[in-house]
């Protein structure tokens, strides 16, 4: 956030610009966190726009017994290893076909024993506060049609009919990982000494970082006809006089009549 | 690039025989897995015949003891040979390849395709 200086009292700014602002010839430059001339206001909405989409990936180990093992198989870059995955593509592709998250899977490794699969299963969703229990959700999907597969595609006299045929007790799950996103964590820490006065909350399922000098959330405060402003104890109302009222109070709601105080025949000297 | 060319169909009186040869380039015989497929019209294609590079062979049960599966490695080609023929038997037969050593009858385990040979058994 920037603000220009035109004129003599450039020079004297520059030496003032605060909260580790710095002079750029112009203007205080100021940190994400500040603006106003000298860098002297702390915003009130910090961008902790959340990812489009959080990804997870499941580490799966499955047996195929449909093929049989060759040192080929070993080699990223052998034929052999780039016809193996291209059937278990295309057969995890229909496993998890009724998964809305699924993206893929990635081969990892694949040892002897008929075939043993070390893969990835990947999985991806549009980001809601709700991505955890989404996600939870499919891994969960991902188990149970990952775990009916291998039961039912399998050898029937050393002869297989299906695209690729599994030991039934040869399916792990190795591990879950999920992409982390605390949008209050990313708030505080974002917010930095001020991280106790802002909060996230969700308009149209996206987080906002505020304080309560933001206008039109639940959190705002009220400050009248005054103006908010966040120290390090707080936001708090800067009251405002105008020609005919001061004003005062928490939240600048109390207003006296400069004429009551001062009397209707007061003159300016 | 593996290529896979069929010849030796024809039309046969039922009780017939023919002999029918897949020659492949792009690819080595002595690895991997090779087969015989066909498809009826109206009829999805099926598993005739295969053999993989360690000596597993394959017959469907209505050729059993009537259709061999052969491969000369030094030609590079893999042969079917069809013995007393029966109308049943009509179909466009498929020579198909893997570098992988299968135990599939599935057709989409078998990445390399000829394409095809019509077979007609009639009188």
């Known amino acids: 956030r920037t603000t220009t200086c035109f004129g003599d009292g450039c020079q004297n700014t520059a030496s003032r610009c605060k909260n580790g602002g710095t002079w750029d010839g112009l203007k205080c430059q100021c940190p994400n966190l500040y603006y106003g001339e000298l860098c002297e206001e702390v915003v009130s909405s910090i961008d902790i726009g959340p990812p489009e989409t959080i990804s997870a990936q499941m580490e799966l180990t499955v047996t195929v017994t449909s093929v049989k093992f060759t040192e080929e198989l070993k080699n990223h870059s052998s034929q052999e290893f780039q016809e193996f995955k291209q059937t278990f593509t295309e057969q995890m592709n229909i496993v998890y076909s009724g998964i809305p998250e699924y993206v893929g899977v990635n081969i990892t490794k694949l040892r002897l024993g008929s075939v043993v699969v070390e893969h990835d299963v990947l999985l991806r969703t549009k980001y809601t506060p709700e991505y955890k229990t989404v996600l939870d959700n499919a891994t969960e999907v991902v188990k149970e049609k990952i775990t009916k597969v291998t039961t039912q595609q399998i050898m029937i006299n050393d002869i297989c009919s299906d695209m690729m045929c599994f030991n039934t007790t040869g399916t792990q799950v190795q591990n879950i990982t999920v992409t982390q996103y605390d949008p209050e964590e990313d708030c505080r820490k974002m917010a930095k000494e001020y991280g106790d006065y802002f909060v996230v909350e969700y308009r149209d399922q996206k987080p906002y970082c505020i304080s309560p000098c933001e206008p039109g959330f639940s959190v705002s405060k009220n400050c009248n006809l005054g103006k908010c402003q966040m120290s390090l104890s707080g936001p708090q109302c800067l009251c405002v006089t105008t020609e005919t009222h001061w004003y005062s109070g928490e939240t600048c709601n109390q207003g006296t009549q400069k004429s009551l105080v001062y009397g209707h025949h007061h003159h300016h000297h | 690039e593996v290529q896979l060319v069929e010849s030796g169909g024809g039309v046969v009186q039922p009780g017939g025989s023919l002999r029918l040869s897949c020659a492949a380039s792009?690819?080595?015989?002595?690895?991997?897995?090779w087969g015989w497929f066909r498809q009826a019209p109206g009829k999805e294609r099926e598993a005739v015949a295969l053999?993989?590079?360690?000596?597993?062979?394959f017959y469907a049960d209505s050729v059993k003891g009537r259709f061999t599966i052969s491969q000369d490695n030094s030609k590079n080609t893999l042969y079917l040979q069809m013995n007393s023929l029966r109308a049943e038997d009509t179909a466009v037969y498929y020579c198909?390849?893997?570098?992988?050593?299968?135990?599939?009858?599935?057709?989409?385990?078998?990445?390399?395709w000829g394409q095809g040979t019509m077979v007609t058994v009639s009188s």
């Open positions: 792009g690819f080595t015989f002595s690895r991997g897995s």
């Open positions: 053999i993989s590079s360690d000596g597993w062979t």
């Open positions: 198909a390849a893997s570098v992988l050593v299968l135990r599939t009858l599935n057709p989409k385990a078998w990445h390399h």
